[in-house]
C-alpha cells in the first residue's frame, strides 16, 4: 500500500490528521457487573482521492484511501463479577487498549505489542 | 454501511469535505495517438474513527470510514486513431466522466450511469 | 461476520515448497495476530507460527525454522504460509487462525489441505 | 516446550450423562498476572477446531452452558455436565504461555 499522505499540493492549507482521543470505555457482559475503563478511540480526517478510471485500463487505478486507526494497540484482560452466577462468578474480557493512531491504508488494520 | 458524517460534536471547527477537480486527463493506448480530455477528479477529507474492540464482542465493531470519491459517474466513449495499425486503424476506450463527489462508506462501490 | 477463506488443496512433490493463502474479512485485520495449525491426517494439531500482521514480525515453531515464511498483505487483509522443501510428513490439513494479541485462537479458516507425493 | 499431556485418549459417553476431560502441563500456566493462559477447543469431525474456553475458564461467545472449565497451574479440567449427540469430535487444550503455542493430543468423545 502506498505511504499515508499528509500533505496535498493542491491544497496547501489542508493536513491530514489522526488522534488518539481519551475515552471511557463501558466494558459488560450479559448477567455481569459493567466496569468503566480508561482507554483511547482514533479519530481524524485522513486524505482520499479517486481518478477516473478507463477501460481498457491504460495503467494502475489511481485510489487512495487513508484511514484513522489504531497503529499501535495491545489487549489486556478486565474482569467482570457476575453476582448471582455462582457457577461463573466472573468473566474474563479482553479489551484492546489503542496506544497511539494514524492515517493508514483503508485496507490496513492496528498494530499490536511485539509477538 | 452508516450515512456519511459531515460533522462531528468532539470538533466542531471540523468539516468533512470532499471536492470535484477539473483536470486534463490523458487518454491513451499502446500504439494509438493519446487524447487529452476535460474530466474531473475527487479528492477530499472524509471522517473517521474506530473504537476499541473487546472479546468476546459486547457489541458490534465500533469502526468508521468515509472516503472521497465519485457520488455519479458516467462512461463515455473516447476514440483514439492508431496508425500503424491497419488492422486496428481506431481503439474505442471508456472513460468514467465524474460529474460530482462526496463523501462514502470506503468499501462501497462507486455508483455509475449507463452509456 | 468474520471470515478466513484459505486457498484450495495442493499437491506437490517432495523438495518443491506450498504457499497456502487466508484472506481475512469483517474485522479490522490488524488488530489480530494470524496463527498457523497444521493436522497430519488422523493426528493431533501441531502449532507452527505466528504472524502479527500489523508490522509483520513473525515467531516461529522450532521444528519449521528455516522452512516456514509466515508474511501478510495489508491492503488485501491477506496472510500467506510458506513451506519449503517439502517431504511426505508435511501433508496435513493447514489452517489459519486469528487471535487477540497472547489470547485464544476465537476464528479458524476451512483448512487448506497439501498432499506431498512423489 | 511446555509439554502438554491429556487424558484419557478416548472417552465414551452416555447422552444425559456427564463428561470429564484432564488436562496436564509440564510447567504451570498461572501468569503472574493471575490468569491461567490455558484454553480448550473442540474439532468436530470434518470441521476446524473451535474455541471452546479460554483463561481456563472462560467460555467463548455462543458456547453452551453444560461446558465448563477450571484448575490451576498445571492441572485443568474440562467439564461437560450432561453430553449431548453434537458435543462428539476431538477435544484439545493448548497452552498460550509461552511460544510456541502448544497442544495436547486429543481426547475423542463419542457417543456409546
Known amino acids: 500500500a502506498p505511504p499515508p499522505i499528509n500533505k496535498l499540493a493542491l491544497f496547501p492549507d489542508k493536513s491530514a490528521w489522526c488522534e488518539a482521543k481519551n475515552i471511557t470505555q463501558i466494558v459488560g457482559h450479559s448477567g455481569c457487573e459493567a466496569k468503566s475503563i480508561q482507554n483511547r478511540a482514533c479519530l481524524g480526517q485522513c486524505f482520499s482521492y479517486s481518478v477516473p478510471n478507463t477501460f481498457p485500463q491504460s495503467t494502475e487505478s489511481l485510489v487512495h484511501c487513508d484511514s484513522c486507526m489504531p497503529a499501535q494497540s495491545m489487549w489486556e484482560i478486565v474482569t467482570l463479577e457476575c453476582p448471582g452466577h455462582e457457577e461463573v462468578p466472573r468473566v474474563d474480557k479482553l479489551v484492546e487498549k489503542i496506544v497511539h493512531c494514524s492515517c493508514q491504508a483503508c485496507g490496513k488494520e492496528p498494530s499490536h505489542e511485539g509477538l | 454501511a452508516p450515512p456519511p458524517i459531515n460533522k462531528l460534536a468532539l470538533f466542531p471547527d471540523k468539516s468533512a469535505w470532499c471536492e470535484a477537480k477539473n483536470i486534463t486527463q490523458i487518454v491513451g493506448h499502446s500504439g494509438c495517438e493519446a487524447k487529452s480530455i476535460q474530466n474531473r477528479a475527487c479528492l477530499g477529507q472524509c471522517f473517521s474513527y474506530s473504537v476499541p474492540n473487546t472479546f468476546p464482542q459486547s457489541t458490534e465493531s465500533l469502526v468508521h470510514c468515509d472516503s472521497c470519491m465519485p457520488a455519479q459517474s458516467m462512461w463515455e466513449i473516447v476514440t483514439l486513431e492508431c496508425p500503424g495499425h491497419e488492422e486496428v486503424p481506431r481503439v474505442d476506450k471508456l472513460v468514467e466522466k465524474i460529474v460530482h463527489c462526496s463523501c462514502q462508506a470506503c468499501g462501497k462501490e462507486p455508483s455509475h450511469e449507463g452509456l | 461476520e468474520v471470515q478466513l477463506v484459505q486457498s484450495g488443496a495442493e499437491v506437490k512433490k517432495p523438495g518443491a515448497s506450498v504457499k497456502v493463502s487466508c484472506k481475512a474479512s469483517g474485522y479490522t485485520f490488524t488488530s489480530y495476530y494470524m496463527h498457523w495449525v497444521r493436522q497430519a491426517p488422523g493426528q493431533g494439531l501441531e502449532w507452527m507460527g505466528i504472524?502479527?500482521?500489523?508490522?509483520?514480525?513473525?515467531s516461529y515453531a522450532q521444528k519449521f525454522q528455516g522452512r516456514v515464511t509466515m508474511t501478510r498483505d495489508t491492503s488485501t487483509s491477506t496472510v500467506y504460509m510458506e513451506l519449503s522443501s517439502l517431504r511426505s510428513e508435511d501433508t496435513a490439513v493447514y489452517y489459519c487462525?486469528?487471535?487477540?494479541?497472547?489470547?485464544?485462537?476465537?476464528?479458524w479458516g476451512q483448512g487448506t489441505l497439501v498432499t506431498v507425493s512423489s | 516446550d511446555v509439554v502438554m499431556t491429556q487424558s484419557p485418549l478416548s472417552l465414551p459417553v452416555t447422552p444425559g450423562e456427564p463428561a470429564s476431560i484432564s488436562c496436564r502441563s509440564s510447567q504451570s500456566l498461572l501468569h503472574s498476572n493471575g490468569y491461567n493462559y490455558l484454553d480448550w477447543y473442540l474439532q468436530k469431525p470434518g470441521q476446524s477446531p473451535q474455541l471452546l474456553i479460554y483463561l481456563g475458564s472462560n467460555r467463548a461467545s455462543g458456547v453452551p452452558d453444560r461446558f465448563s472449565g477450571s484448575g490451576s497451574g498445571t492441572d485443568f479440567t474440562l467439564k461437560i455436565s450432561r453430553v449431548e449427540a453434537e458435543d462428539v469430535g476431538v477435544y484439545y487444550c493448548?497452552?498460550?504461555?509461552?511460544?510456541?503455542?502448544?497442544f495436547g493430543g486429543g481426547t475423542k468423545v463419542e457417543i456409546k
Open positions: 493448548m497452552q498460550a504461555l509461552q511460544t510456541p503455542r502448544t
Open positions: 487462525a486469528r487471535a487477540p494479541g497472547k489470547f485464544p485462537l476465537d476464528y
Open positions: 504472524i502479527n500482521p500489523s508490522g509483520g514480525s513473525t
